[in-house]
Interface confidence: medium
């Protein structure tokens, strides 16, 4: 038997992936566990093997289909179970009735690129990945810029309250190396959370033009 508190958290990427984390105090050792997904109005079901991410935490990704296929809708409910093997049995360790579009976490934005860079400003664009067409333009973004001598945690957050896949960074220092990240969140969903941060994009501002007297 397993005692202790259990936490089972899952997010839908809006297309064909449900990512789950299960944590259990006083957890099992050397036991095979999986997440089982059973939709209420679909013919398919899916499982993934939970793999350890820490001493008392496991994670897995339910791959529901091709990355850009729309496998679930706003009316779907998916029963998600954590099943752990005990001898010949599969014991239910946790269960939730999962509403995919109330628990969204999109993939990190991709394809970051510098569109134009000057001495004091830089225009950067990006793309969203595997985001449902259901959102239309109902997305928001957060961005941050890493300045020399600072950490990401110290970087101020820039909020874009609309689906705008570009930004013009101002008041930058000439001839300086920066890094830039962006993340995305749908407006829909009671338990929806921000995507992971994108891979950092490194760029350098142009040097200031030399004065005539120098």
């Amino acid at each position: 038997a397993v005692n202790g508190t259990s936490q089972f958290t899952c997010f839908y990427n809006s297309r064909a992936n449900i990512s789950c984390v299960w944590s259990q105090d006083g957890a099992l050792q050397d036991t095979s566990c999986q997440v089982h997904a059973w939709p209420d109005r679909r013919r398919w079901n899916q499982t993934c093997e939970l793999l350890p991410v820490s001493q008392a935490s496991w994670a897995c990704n339910l791959i529901l289909g091709a990355p850009d296929s729309q496998k679930l809708t706003t009316v779907d409910i998916v029963t998600l179970r954590v099943l752990c093997r005990e001898g010949v049995r599969w014991r239910v360790m946790a269960i939730q009735d999962f509403k995919p579009f109330e628990n969204l976490r999109l993939m990190a934005p991709i394809s970051l690129q510098v569109v134009h860079v000057e001495t004091h400003r830089c225009n950067i664009s990006w793309e969203i990945s595997q985001a449902s067409h259901y959102f239309e333009r109902h997305l928001e973004f957060e961005a941050r810029t890493l300045s020399p001598g600072h950490t990401w945690e110290e970087a101020p957050l820039l909020t874009l309250k609309q689906k705008q896949e570009w930004i013009c960074l101002e008041t930058l220092t000439p001839d300086t190396q920066y890094e830039f990240q962006v993340r995305v969140k749908p407006l829909q969903g009671e338990f929806t959370t921000w995507s992971p941060w994108s891979q950092p994009l490194a760029f350098r501002t142009k040097p200031a033009a030399l004065g005539k007297d120098t």
Partner: nanobody, 123 residues
């Protein structure tokens, strides 16, 4: 493990109705498939009905289909067996059972059993 206490049994005339309840305590109720079994005098214990953890799937032995309804209230940690159009052959001790084995529905190998409640149907 979960502990189970049945109630609602009694004496009823043929054609009558009873509603059995099974209250669970001691563990996370929603993790368990719940079932009702019965044992008539001189006979082996037999499966009657079950309801999965989420409440989405129910199963019945053929002899009670259309007469008995199994349900659960996860907020109240309780499973019910509504028995209508009772017959004398339904007379038995009715047991509530719980199982965390996801693929185990009808087997007598359920993890946990209640003490049982007597149902007597007179003709």
């Amino acid at each position: 493990e979960v502990q189970l206490v049945e109630s609602g049994g009694g004496l009823v005339q043929a054609g009558g109705s009873l509603r059995l309840s099974c209250a669970a305590s001691g563990d996370v109720f929603v993790r368990y498939t719940m079932a009702w079994f019965r044992q008539a005098p001189g006979k082996e214990r037999e499966f009657v009905a079950s309801v999965t953890d989420s409440g989405r799937t129910t199963d019945y032995v053929d002899s009670v289909k259309g007469r008995f309804t199994v349900s659960r209230d996860n907020a109240k940690n309780t499973v019910y067996l509504q028995m209508n159009n009772l017959k004398p052959e339904d007379t038995a001790v009715y047991y509530c059972a719980a199982n965390t084995d996801y693929f185990q529905i009808r087997s007598l190998e359920f993890n946990t059993w209640g003490q049982g409640t007597q149902v007597t149907v007179s003709s």
